[in-house]
Interface confidence: medium
């Protein structure tokens, strides 16, 4: 009669995390009798992961085929897999001893791949708001995926940007990995309503990838221009200069009007117009009483936009 | 002989807050000798429901005598059920062994889904009161609602409204879910007696949906009209002058009479006209001794409403 | 009602033995494992072993293989705890309990020469 | 053999005080098979929490259970006269079975 053989038919399983994997595994013979062992790796360190005669092993399950009283098959099924169970797994029989059962023969092995989706990509952008023409980074994160390779692309608004670093870590094997991109964003005036995407694509996505944005207006400072201008009246001794404060992100925007220097009044902006851009307009106007001053007067509009340096603009007005 | 098979006959069972669920096993065969356990989920952090010869199960009950000698039915009902409870629950064979018993077959499992009610609607408006043809935002919350399908409507005076956007969170597989709404409604001048109401249909109602309202009253505030009138007096030296105050909401209202800019006095609305649509009307008065001024009199009737900036409507009283 | 009812006190010599019984009411041995714990004077609880009267098949704690043996008798519905060889160590108070939930009065044995 | 560790082995609590007992296995226990024993003197054990967390029929609320792998734990929210006794913790999850060996709570 021949020896038993110990049959492993999968050289290798690749299992999606949080399925069951099916490792499969027969003996030839009923002889010698003995128990079957399943091992996670070879050697002294190797991992019990399912003993046919003792211990407890709750996601291990015999696979539940309609067999006959002389089962030859010891294939199991191991429930919830997650990255960390990849590795190569033994079938072994063990023959009958005393005191302990000894080692008879073990399958040549099976091993075990686990394909672990990315996590979500999020993309975060600078702490503080930059102005246009100057350069930001966004960076993307996502993590616990499995196998290694990965593609990661940067868009602007659809367009796909060169400007970026990537790193996938760690550099050696390891049950999942973390990928962490850096990308160099040229800021423009129109912006605000500019968006910058991170695009992941990986083998368990099944072609469909996935996307973290993240809105430039979130991290842009579009300066204000300003106008001063001096509008008709119909009465003599007034005069209506107007201060229209154009094109500016984000609202955030205090006013002050000045004679000769000295303020006369100081407004916040509330109702703006939004233009198509994103960007934002305002108007204010000064009536000043033309009989109050002898001389020419100077006024200027100086304005503090979300919280940096005020900026200004002056008009003389002559005093006919 | 054939190996026994562990049949579990229903892929899922749905089963309403607080009611009792059966879960159905039955075994094809009484060999191998061994205990019959039930557990929630799969793998190592599998949950154990119900341990046939031993242990304490108090919410479950067996719904045979597990102690007839050939039986077969291991069905198991598990009292008053929550959300908490919902899963997928295996019948598992063991089979005697040393020195722990061995797991022998698993049923394929039976779905338990949970059907919970959403939690009566909460309406919530804007912490500020805002005026007419502005838009303010209101809230609608619900808990507890199982399974995650859920459809919400928003309605104003029973005309149902467009403009909101719906969440249901989480996004992912979850006990239980929360529902978050918020609708945009534009005011118009008669929203005081409105109402917005939060309707939501769920598979546990029944067709009958929970509505939730809120009143537009709490978040309206309509500025009042003001009208500056003479009127008749017999007597010679004295003026009645009224301020008709029309058409406001909330009640909040304070109103000085200034003479030549000077405050002559002060009064806070108590007795209001309700008009059909809400609002309130009032009128205040003031009795002007002619013979106290050489010079016409401008008169000048100043309301405060809710807090907010004084508007005024002023008159000239000739003194002839 | 579940109920589990353990033979009266017993006073032994050393080196004799002594079978304890527990019989069940209100439910059927045969359903459940019966299990031993030994408890000496203000001391705590020991696992001696537990059997499966469906089949008699037993299992024991290290400590009392050879000391212990633990038998059932599904017709009478009782489960015995039979102590060989006693000694004063052997003084304590033996619980029978079913499945780890509903537990007896408990029997005192006295080894005492 | 888990060797079940439990500690204080005595402590006294006043009425009103937050009591935690503490039960460490030398190696992981499964959380189904974590079973708390109340016992007073003259007395059965008698089944207090079961499966790590859950409170046996008649069991006061403010009774809680908690904890995985080696270490979990028996907490009193509000201590009660009526909970002077000693406490065993109790593994099923392998053979041979163990207790700990016990806390003896007294009211201060």
């Known amino acids: 009669e021949d020896e038993l053989q110990v049959i492993q038919p999968e050289k290798s399983v690749s299992v999606a995390a949080g399925e069951s994997a099916t490792l499969r595994c027969a003996m030839t013979s009923l002889i010698p009798v003995g128990p079957i062992m399943w091992f996670r790796g070879a050697g002294a360190g190797r991992e019990l992961i399912y003993n046919q005669k003792e211990g407890h092993f709750p996601r291990v399950t015999t696979v539940s085929e309609l067999t006959k009283r002389n089962n030859l098959d010891f294939s199991i099924s191991i429930s919830n897999i997650t990255p960390a169970d990849a590795g190569t797994y033994y079938c072994v029989k063990f023959r009958k001893g005393s005191p302990d059962d000894v080692e008879f023969k073990s399958g040549a092995g099976t091993e075990l791949s686990v394909r672990a989706k990315p996590s979500a990509p999020v993309v975060s952008g600078p702490a503080v708001r930059a102005t246009p023409e100057h350069t930001v980074s966004f960076t993307c994160e996502s993590h616990g995926f499995s196998p290694r390779d990965i593609t990661l692309k940067w868009f602007k608004n659809g367009n796909e940007l060169s400007d970026f670093q990537t790193n996938v870590d760690p550099a050696g094997d390891s049950v999942s990995y973390s990928i962490h991109s850096t990308a160099r964003v040229v800021l423009t005036r129109g912006d605000v309503h500019s968006q910058v995407i991170c695009e992941i694509a990986h083998i368990t996505l099944q072609g469909d990838p996935l996307r973290g944005t993240a809105n430039l207006s979130e991290a842009i400072r579009v300066p204000p221009t300003l106008e001063v201008t001096q509008q008709p009246m119909r009465a003599e001794n007034q005069a209506n200069v107007t201060c229209q404060v154009s094109n500016f992100y984000p609202r955030g925007l205090q006013l002050t009007w000045l004679e000769n220097g000295n303020v006369s009044r100081t407004e916040t902006a509330s109702t703006l117009i939004e233009n198509k851009d994103g960007t934002y307009n305002w108007m204010s106007w000064l009536l000043v009483n033309t009989c109050a001053h002898r001389d020419d007067v100077v006024l200027t509009c100086q304005v503090e936009h979300d919280g940096q340096q005020a900026v200004s603009k002056s008009y003389a007005l002559e005093i006919s | 002989e054939d190996e026994l098979q562990v049949i579990q006959p229903e892929k899922s069972v749905s089963v309403a807050a607080g009611e009792s669920a059966t879960l159905r096993c039955a075994m094809t065969s009484l060999i191998p000798v061994g205990p019959i356990m039930w557990f929630r989920g799969a793998g190592a952090g599998r949950e154990l429901i119900y341990n046939q010869k031993e242990g304490h199960f108090p919410r479950v009950t067996t719904v045979s005598e597990l102690t007839k000698r050939n039986n077969l039915d291991f069905s198991i009902s598990i009292s008053n059920i929550t959300p908490a409870d919902a899963g997928t629950y295996y019948c598992v064979k063991f089979r005697k062994g040393s020195p722990d018993d061995v797991e022998f077959k698993s049923g394929a499992g039976t779905e338990l889904s949970v059907r919970a009610k959403p939690s009566a609607p909460v309406v919530s408006g804007p912490a500020v009161r805002a005026t007419p043809e502005h838009t303010v935002s209101f809230t609608c919350e619900s808990h507890g609602f199982s399974p995650r399908d859920i459809t919400l409507k928003w309605f104003k005076n029973g005309n149902e409204l467009s403009d909101f956007q719906t969440n249901v969170d989480p996004a992912g597989d979850s006990v239980s879910y929360s529902i978050h709404s918020t609708a945009r409604v534009v005011l118009t001048r008669g929203d005081v007696h409105s109402q917005v109401i939060c309707e939501i249909a769920h598979i546990t109602l029944q067709g009958d949906p929970l509505r939730g309202t809120a009143n537009l009253s709490e978040a309206i505030r309509v500025p009042p009209t003001l009208e500056v009138t003479q009127q008749p007096m017999r007597a010679e030296n004295q003026a009645n002058v009224t301020c008709q105050v029309s058409n406001f909401y909330p009640r909040g209202l304070q109103l000085t009479w200034l003479e030549n800019g000077n405050v002559s006095r002060t009064e806070t609305a108590s007795t209001l006209i309700e008009n059909k649509d809400g609002t309130y009307n009032w009128m205040s008065w003031l009795l002007v001794n002619t013979c106290a001024h050489r010079d016409d009199v401008v008169l000048t009737c100043q309301v405060e409403h809710d807090g907010q900036q004084a508007v005024s409507k002023s008159y000239a009283l000739e003194i002839s | 009602e579940v109920q589990l009812q353990q033979s009266g006190a017993e006073l032994v010599k050393p080196g004799a033995s002594v079978k304890l019984s527990c019989t069940a009411s209100?439910?059927?041995?045969?359903?459940?494992?019966m299990h031993w714990v030994k408890q000496r004077t203000e001391q705590g609880l020991e696992w001696i072993g537990r059997?499966?009267?469906?089949?008699?098949?037993?299992k024991y704690a290290p400590k009392f293989q050879g000391k212990a043996t633990i038998t059932a008798d599904t017709s009478s519905n009782t489960a015995y705890l039979q102590l060989s060889s006693l000694t004063s160590e052997d003084t304590a108070v033996y619980y029978c309990?079913?499945?780890?939930?509903?537990w007896g009065q408990g029997t005192l044995v006295t080894v005492s020469a | 053999q888990i060797v079940l560790t439990q500690s204080p082995a005595i402590m006294s609590a006043s009425p009103g005080e937050k009591v935690t007992l503490t039960c460490s296995a030398s190696?992981?226990?499964?959380?189904?098979?974590l079973y708390w024993y109340q016992q007073k003197p003259g007395s059965s054990p008698k089944l207090w929490i079961y499966s790590t967390s859950n409170l046996a029929s008649g069991v006061p609320a403010r009774f809680s259970g908690s904890g995985s792998g080696t270490s979990y734990s028996l907490t009193i929210s509000s201590m009660e006269a009526e909970d002077a006794a000693s406490y065993f913790c109790h593994q099923w999850s392998s053979y041979p079975y163990t207790f700990g060996g016990g806390t003896k709570l007294e009211i201060k």
């Open positions: 309990d079913r499945g780890l939930a509903y």
């Open positions: 059997i499966d009267p469906e089949d008699g098949e037993t």
């Open positions: 190696s992981s226990v499964s959380s189904s098979y």
């Open positions: 209100g439910f059927n041995i045969k359903d459940y494992y």
